[in-house]
């Protein structure tokens, strides 16, 4: 069975084809090759000689037991080598020779028992080494690591490391890898020698499900003393053994680390006193809780020095009381409990993501809701009912505003966005908005992107609501049940590049409303009911137009519409997916491609 | 279409068939077997994925006695610092995991429940596997 040609001459997918040897019928130009799940078993030297241009090679689950000297010799362009799930028993000293450009080596679940004997010391370009799910017992980083000066990611998770000693990290003292991220999760740790991490600098350290008791966790974290880490991730996994007890003493040792960003990811334990618990983390710049349950929500009003707070997939009794002076970014998404938003006091806040919480807002939105006048980014998407009762007074700095898939009320009662002269991006898609007021978008003089799909208009008519949006470049009006539009609806949109009118109820096409759109490049009218043109004589679309989508409409392929059908043929160079432009009537022509039609009509004198 | 039996409990019998061409082997055990009136137990899965499990989600199509419920999307792996350790599993890596579950207080009517589980993962998104579970429910069968 042949390999699948994914990208001609470049990418080949040969997965699970029962190959016993490397295929030699693929082009020399192959750059990406997936040979996974084939019983190759043995790699002799120069095994991939017929792939001189190869960049990515996937050999996952190929039952490889032996890799000879120079097996990959000649692959000087290879950047990624994946060996996941091979029961390697014999790995020659020169197994990886010739890989002068290798950046990523994945040797997950390959029976690797030690880093010491892993022959990769010459791979100077290596950026990522993944040796997770192996049998490694010692965390001693071999001397050859001093050659791996580009290493950024080292994944040692799911191994058998129990202890870390001062001598294990000696090589890092010799050549501090300033950018190294280290994952030690799911190793059964019970001892970290104090001083082992002294004066070590890491970009990221991840320790999840490493400790089988509170005491072990406490002493191991104390053993991290002296570490300087940009991002520290602690926590557990839902499907692994969890700590039976967790209290403030667990994290006391963190006072002896220098941490820029902290994340606690999943804890099967109720956090009740976060002030004491995170006492050593009051001055990290970024603090993050993922999948934890928080009992006392008032604690977030304590004077933490965080600049970024992230609460994701957590459980709360009610919406937390947030009073944090220094906070610039708040991400509060996919949380449960506390369905009603209550005011927060965050005077420095610039970025606020409150999406996907099912929250309801009794009144939105003004400075008093968020306690800030500095807000630039606000995401309230995928929430409940949001009642618009103020037009963003005090929030004039906003540049990005997203309400999609929330239920907006009172949108047509006043100019909701009047204050937002700096707004660049607005998404009110699928918000149950019924446009019944022409001043709905007044004030949005800087707006570039407007997404309002899935809403509706009074009498299914698009009025002149865009008159102030002179900087608009993208407009989505799809799925709005529109049947007609004002001939001057788009007259002020001279910068508009993309207009999506798809999935509406237009029965005819007219070029007149688009005559002022001098920058228009994409016009999508697919999934309407267009049968013919509004007027007998259709003019040309703006000369800037490059893509016109008229697919899945109800074209009437009859003599009375001959001029319209001819006009469509004249637009051939603009049309996309022409094979999906089919006649709907008459019945004998139903399903026929419009462009292949040859209508010759007799003119009655 | 070969049917794979999972388990029987006092009020339910559970089995599954594959609804994809590939039919990559997957081993599923539930201990103790699910009782629809209330249940607490462990789900054990042994599987070798044909693609990375990063950003894994399930599309669930549930049918109750021939009546179709709306499609449900259950996101399992978001893509970073996920709840489940298997979210970091790579293509070709053994996934051997036990997940605890519990539910209570749901009254199910007697009949045949079908649940098509479409597992989607990776970037670009592609189907990982598709299983159709059949649960025959006999309330108070003892």
């Amino acid at each position: 069975e042949p390999c699948v040609e994914v990208v001609p001459n470049i990418t080949y997918q040969c997965m699970e084809l029962n190959f016993y040897k490397i295929p030699d019928n693929l082009p020399f130009s192959t750059k990406n090759l997936d040979l996974s799940f084939n019983p190759l078993r043995h790699l002799g030297s120069y095994s991939f000689f017929s792939f001189p241009e190869l960049q990515v090679l996937d050999l996952s689950r190929c039952e490889i037991q032996t890799i000879e000297d120079g097996a990959y010799q000649s692959l000087s362009h290879l950047s990624t080598l994946i060996l996941t799930g091979n029961p390697i028993q014999s790995l020659a000293l020169g197994a990886f020779s010739g890989l002068s450009s290798l950046q990523k080596l994945v040797a997950v679940e390959t029976n690797l028992a030690s880093l010491e004997n892993f022959p990769i010391g010459h791979l100077k370009t290596l950026k990522e080494l993944n040796v997770a799910h192996n049998l490694i017992q010692s965390f001693k980083l071999p001397e050859y690591f001093s050659n791996l000066t580009n290493l950024e990611h080292l994944d040692l998770s799911s191994n058998k490391i129990q202890s870390i000693y001062c001598t294990d990290l000696r090589v890092l003292h010799q050549m501090p890898l300033l950018n190294l991220s280290l994952d030690l999760s799911l190793n059964p740790m019970n001892f970290i020698q104090p001083g082992a991490f002294k004066e070590i600098r890491l970009h990221k350290l991840t320790l999840r499900n490493n400790f089988d008791s509170l005491n072990v966790m406490k002493t191991c974290i104390q053993g991290l003393a002296g570490l300087e880490v940009h991002r520290l991730v602690l926590g557990e996994f839902r499907n692994e053994g969890n700590l039976e007890k967790f209290d403030k003493s667990a994290l006391e040792g963190l006072c002896n680390l220098t941490i820029e960003e902290f994340r606690l990811a999943y804890l099967d334990y109720y956090l009740d006193d976060i002030i004491d618990l995170f006492n050593c983390l009051t001055n990290v710049s970024s603090f993050s809780l993922v999948s934890v349950t928080i009992e006392r929500v008032k604690d977030f009003s304590y004077n933490f020095g965080w600049q970024h707070l992230e609460l994701v997939n957590c459980k709360f009794g009610q919406f937390p009381t947030l009073k944090l002076k220094s906070l610039k970014r708040l991400t509060f998404t996919s949380n449960k409990g506390g369905n009603a938003f209550s005011e927060v006091d965050l005077p420095s806040l610039e970025f606020l993501d409150l999406s996907r919480n099912g929250l309801s807002f009794k009144g939105c939105c003004s400075q008093s809701d968020f306690g800030t006048t500095s807000l630039k980014y606000l995401d309230l998407s995928f929430n409940g009912v949001i009642t618009m009762s103020s037009n963003f007074l005090g929030l004039e700095q906003l540049e990005h505003l997203d309400f999609q898939h929330s239920n907006l009320k009172q949108m047509s009662e006043f100019s909701v966005f009047l204050s937002l002269r700096n707004l660049i991006y607005l998404d009110i898609s699928h918000t149950h908005t019924r446009v019944a007021f022409n001043g709905i978008f007044n004030g949005l003089s800087s707006l570039e992107v407007l997404k309002m799909a899935g809403n509706s208009f009074q009498e299914n008519f698009l009025p002149d609501i865009f008159t102030e949006l002179r900087n608009l470049t993208f407009l989505d009006l799809s799925q709005c049940q529109l049947e007609q539009l004002s001939p001057t609806a788009f007259n002020s949109l001279s910068s508009l590049q993309v207009l999506n009118m798809s999935h509406n109820n237009f029965f005819s096409l007219d070029t007149f409303p688009y005559k002022c759109l001098n920058s228009l490049q994409v016009l999508d009218y697919s999934l309407n009911h267009i049968m013919t043109s509004k007027k007998q004589e259709l003019q040309h679309f703006p000369s800037s137009l490059a893509f016109l989508n008229l697919t899945q409409n109800d074209f009437a392929c009859t003599c009375e519409h001959q001029s319209f059908l001819q006009w469509i043929k004249d637009q051939r160079q603009l049309l996309v997916e022409v094979e999906r432009m089919e006649c709907a009537t008459p019945s004998d022509k139903q399903g026929m491609p419009v462009l292949s039609l040859n209508i010759t009509c007799q003119m009655n004198k | 279409q070969k049917q794979y039996w999972v388990c029987n409990s006092s009020d339910a019998s559970i089995s599954y068939t594959y609804c994809d061409k590939m039919q990559y082997p997957i081993s599923i055990n539930v201990n103790p077997c699910i009782e629809l009136k209330r249940s607490k137990g462990l789900l054990h899965i042994f599987y070798i994925p044909r693609r990375d499990l990063k950003q894994l989600y399930f599309n669930l199509y549930i049918t109750v006695n021939t009546m179709n419920l709306p499609k449900r999307k259950e996101v399992i792996c978001r893509g970073s610092d996920d709840d489940y350790s298997f979210c970091r599993a790579l293509k070709g890596e053994t996934v051997n995991t036990t997940i605890s579950f519990s539910f209570k207080g749901i009254k199910f009517s007697k009949g045949k429940y079908k649940c098509v589980v479409e597992a989607i993962s990776g970037s670009p998104e592609e189907m990982l596997f598709c299983l159709e579970f059949v649960i025959l429910h006999q309330p108070n069968s003892n």
């Epitope: 040897k21 030699d24 019928n25 020399f28 002799g44 030297s45 120069y46 095994s47 000689f49 017929s50 | -």
Partner: nanobody
């Protein structure tokens, strides 16, 4: 056991020509991917010519138009014709059978 013996190397002036030969034993080469790989001191090794069993050939840009690989299955031999040689063509040239190994190599030195 597969054995590959190269010959034809030597010292040649820039602009000159050489023809390398490689005789294989312990294997029938007709179904094998074969070629030449060169290693110059202090430089990254590179494949300079590859020939498949169907006769299709590959050359990197650095030798394209100057080198030509051919095979004689009856003689179990593969050849490399090198014309318009340049100083940077200096190195040890190894005969390769993909997945089987290489010979001991033959030295090619191009002088000015």
């Amino acid at each position: 056991e597969v054995q590959l013996v190269e010959s034809g190397g030597g010292l040649v002036q820039a602009g000159g020509s050489l023809r390398l030969s490689c005789v294989a034993s312990g294997i029938t080469i007709s179904t094998e991917v074969m070629g030449w790989y060169r290693q110059a001191p202090g430089k990254q090794g590179e494949s300079v010519a590859i020939i498949k069993s169907d006769g299709s050939t590959y050359y990197p840009d650095s030798v394209k138009g100057r080198f030509a690989i051919s095979r004689d299955n009856a003689k179990n031999t593969v050849y490399l014709q090198m014309n318009s040689l340049k100083l940077e063509d200096t190195g040890v040239y190894y005969c390769i059978i993909a997945g089987r190994g290489r010979g001991q190599g033959t030295q090619v030195t191009v002088s000015s």
